[in-house]
């Protein structure tokens, strides 16, 4: 009978092993080993045994020991099991962005590795095991499907192989793929909310606000705002899960008409858009014309208001007759009209909205100077030693200068409190003077002496 030792060997690929072949008789006729592996007899052997060194063992093999004894021929095999770790452990690329709530399929490919019975493939999230499967096929492919939540954003996924040769070899061989970071996103199905003026006047500034809630991760979201061909430059404010993009928009005459305002929020590989129509219009303020802005009293003045051809005007609150873009009226200028405002209000309908423009002109009426009995009484009688305030008001535009002099040398303190003395008595010549001329009026002051009983 032929014996082999060891009967089983686990060795690394390319490794060497010593195998002892022995015969049961003392003097075998022949004793040897049959193997395709490179072998070397280790001398000296014994009468009934030989030691062989097998090298460069690349794959599982069963070398056979044989012996020929007087009682017959026999053989025995040793089982060589080769182990090696996989040459490639690779996690298939993850999608650049993974929507929250959608399942993610993780796929791992393992090339090589033996013995396969001892080779396990694991899919990991960080260090947490998601799936453990045997390696089957070449290359071995292992898949698992996992639900994706917001907390998976930024998580590392990898694939690990375990070659467990225990208890034969007190070793656990691990190979781990390069990790892949997952980027998750959550873009709600609702479109962004767009707040903007429905109508916008040429050369004026409007504000557009686009906002969306329920975004994750909000910092990765991008906003695109455009009015027609004009890209807007918004200022973006981020909340916890929301963003608000605010932009100023100024439109020119070339953009007059209907324009599309577009707000797009891009996150991951998805976009949510909102479109709105904005009507750009041109509406100059109406013109208020006075035949002359400064006239002398008694002059006829034509007040005219003219606006946009499609506008309807009101002049000083009175609508044009028939309703339209022009209105006018005639007046004879009086002092009461000095400083009078003529206001023209024009109304234009733009995209169902009424827009208003006003223009005001002031009329200056030149009149006077005037000194009337009502405002400058011709006679004052005052008790001696009493406190009095001489009043004399000159009227006119431009406002006249006023002086009241007695004998050209004594002024009467108009509008000032005076103590009445004999010196105050007399006739004063009051003169009101402006660039339009001069008027005079005599004012007499009488001083009553106190009666002594």
């Amino acid at each position: 009978q032929t014996s082999v030792f060891p009967p089983e060997v686990i060795l690394p690929r390319g490794g060497s092993v010593k195998v002892n072949c022995s015969a049961s008789c003392d003097q075998p006729i022949s004793l040897g080993m049959e193997t395709p592996l490179p072998k070397k007899e280790i001398l000296p052997g014994g009468n009934n045994w030989k030691m062989y060194e097998l090298s460069n063992v690349q794959e599982d093999s069963q070398p056979m020991c044989y012996s020929n004894c007087p009682d017959g021929q026999s053989s025995a095999k040793t089982l060589l099991t080769v182990y090696w770790t996989p040459e490639r452990v690779e996690l298939a690329p993850l999608p650049p962005w993974q929507p929250v709530g959608k399942n993610l399929t993780l796929r791992c490919q393992v090339e090589g590795g033996a013995p396969r019975a001892n080779l396990t493939v694991m899919l990991l999230r960080g260090e947490k095991e998601l799936s453990r499967q045997s390696a089957v096929g070449e290359p071995a492919e292992v898949t698992t499907t996992v639900p994706v939540g917001r907390d998976d954003h930024g998580a590392n996924f990898s694939c690990r192989t375990e070659l467990d040769l225990r208890p034969y070899v007190l070793k656990l061989f691990e190979n781990t793929s390069a990790p892949h970071q997952l980027q998750t996103f959550d873009l709600p199905a609702t479109p962004p909310q767009l707040v903007s003026p429905q109508v916008l006047e040429v050369d004026t500034q409007g504000t557009v606000v686009c906002s969306l809630d329920g975004l994750f991760p909000v910092s990765e979201a991008q906003v695109s705002l455009a009015l027609g061909d004009q890209k807007l430059n918004p200022t973006i404010t981020y909340g916890n899960n929301s963003l608000s993009a605010k932009a100023s928009v100024k439109v020119t005459a070339e953009e007059e008409g209907t324009q599309q305002l577009l707000c797009g929020v891009m996150l991951g590989n998805q976009t949510q858009e909102t479109r709105q129509t904005v009507t750009i219009y041109s509406f100059p303020a109406p013109n208020v014309n006075l035949t002359k802005p400064e006239v002398s009293e008694g002059t006829e003045v034509i007040v005219e208001c003219e606006a946009h051809p499609r506008a309807k005007v009101m002049l000083n609150g009175v609508p044009a007759q028939p309703p339209g873009p022009r209105a006018q009226f005639l007046l004879k200028a009086t002092p009461e009209d000095n400083g009078r405002s003529f206001s023209c209000s024009a109304t234009l309908e733009v995209a169902g909205q009424l827009v208003h423009k006003n223009q005001t002109r002031e009329l200056r009426v030149l009149y006077g100077p005037r000194l009337d009995e009502k405002d400058c009484p011709g006679n004052w009688t005052w008790p001696e030693n009493s406190q009095q305030t001489p009043m004399c008001q000159a009227w006119g535009n431009p406002l006249p200068q006023l002086k009241c002099l007695k004998d050209g040398t004594f002024p009467l303190p108009i509008g000032q409190s005076v103590t009445v003395t004999r010196d105050l008595e007399g006739t004063y010549l009051c003169q009101a003077r402006s660039t339009r001329g001069e008027v005079t009026r005599e004012v007499t002051v009488n001083v009553l002496s106190p009666r002594y009983e």
């Epitope: 002086k403 002099l405 004998d407 050209g408 004594f410 002024p411 303190p413 005076v418 003169q431």
Partner: antibody, heavy 117, light 110 residues
Framework: QSVEESGGGLVKPGGTLTLTCTVS????????MGWVRQAPGKGLEYIGI?????RTYYASWAKGRFTISKTSTTVDLKITSPTTEDTATYFC??????????????WGPGTLVTVSS | AYDMTQTPASVEVAVGGTVTIKCQAS??????LSWYQQKPGQRPKFLIY???KVASGVPSRFKGSGSGTEFTLTISAVQSDDAATYYC????????????FGGGTEVMVK
């Protein structure tokens, strides 16, 4: 409209001197005329005024020593018994008490009176 | 008597500076006060009337204020051309007067 003084010059103490102010471009019946003097290196000194009604008013120190009178186009200042202290430039002024703008504050260029024996 | 007291008699001021001249009436003259500027060898130039009204052609640097018995002439951003003697004159009473003019203030600009 203008005013101009004349009649200044050298006068002996105790004599009599009359200065004349000739006006043009306005009527003395509607304007008061005053006389102001200024001794060499000294300040302005008010002498008196003649009103539009011909009434005269004098500074307290000038009463009795000066007399103001007028015709239709001239205003005279008569200095009685001048002393060396009356040596000064004498100005004729229209409407010194008017409260209108400067067109009514016409000053003549002044005439120099020197009192010396 | 309606007499005028003017202070100071003289003042020195740097170009660009501000000068203030005061004038006091012995009794109320309301707002009937005028200010004059006089340069050597020239007749007085009318600056301000009715205490605060600036005569035409006078720079706005000249400002008058006051009423009753206390009056002030302020010259701001003084220029070298402002070197002169300044007089106040009461324009209220032509009788009962010693002198209708203040004694004058000589302004020297350095």
């Amino acid at each position: 409209q203008s005013v101009e003084e004349s009649g200044g010059g050298l006068v002996k103490p105790g004599g009599t001197l009359t200065l004349t102010c000739t006006v043009s471009g306005f009527s003395l019946s509607t304007h008061a005329m005053g006389w102001v003097r200024q001794a060499p290196g000294k300040g302005l000194e008010y002498i008196g005024i003649i009103g539009s009604s011909d009434r005269t008013y004098y500074a307290s120190w000038a009463k009795g020593r000066f007399t103001i009178s007028k015709t239709s186009t001239t205003v005279d200042l008569k200095i009685t018994s001048p002393t060396t202290e009356d040596t000064a430039t004498y100005f004729c002024v229209r409407d010194p008490y008017d409260s209108f703008d400067d067109g009514y504050r016409l000053w003549g260029p002044g005439t120099l009176v020197t009192v010396s024996s | 008597a309606y007499d005028m007291t003017q202070t100071p008699a003289s003042v020195e001021v740097a170009v660009g500076g501000t000068v203030t001249i005061k004038c006091q009436a012995s009794q109320s003259i309301y707002s009937y006060l005028s200010w004059y500027q006089q340069k050597p060898g020239q007749r007085p130039k009318f600056l301000i009337y009715d205490a605060s009204k600036v005569a035409s052609g006078v720079p706005s640097r000249f400002k008058g204020s006051g009423s009753g018995t206390e009056f002030t002439l302020t010259i701001s951003a003084v220029q070298s051309d402002d070197a002169a003697t300044y007089y106040c004159q009461q324009a209220y009473s032509s009788s009962n007067v010693d002198n209708a003019f203040g004694g004058g203030t000589e302004v020297m600009v350095k």
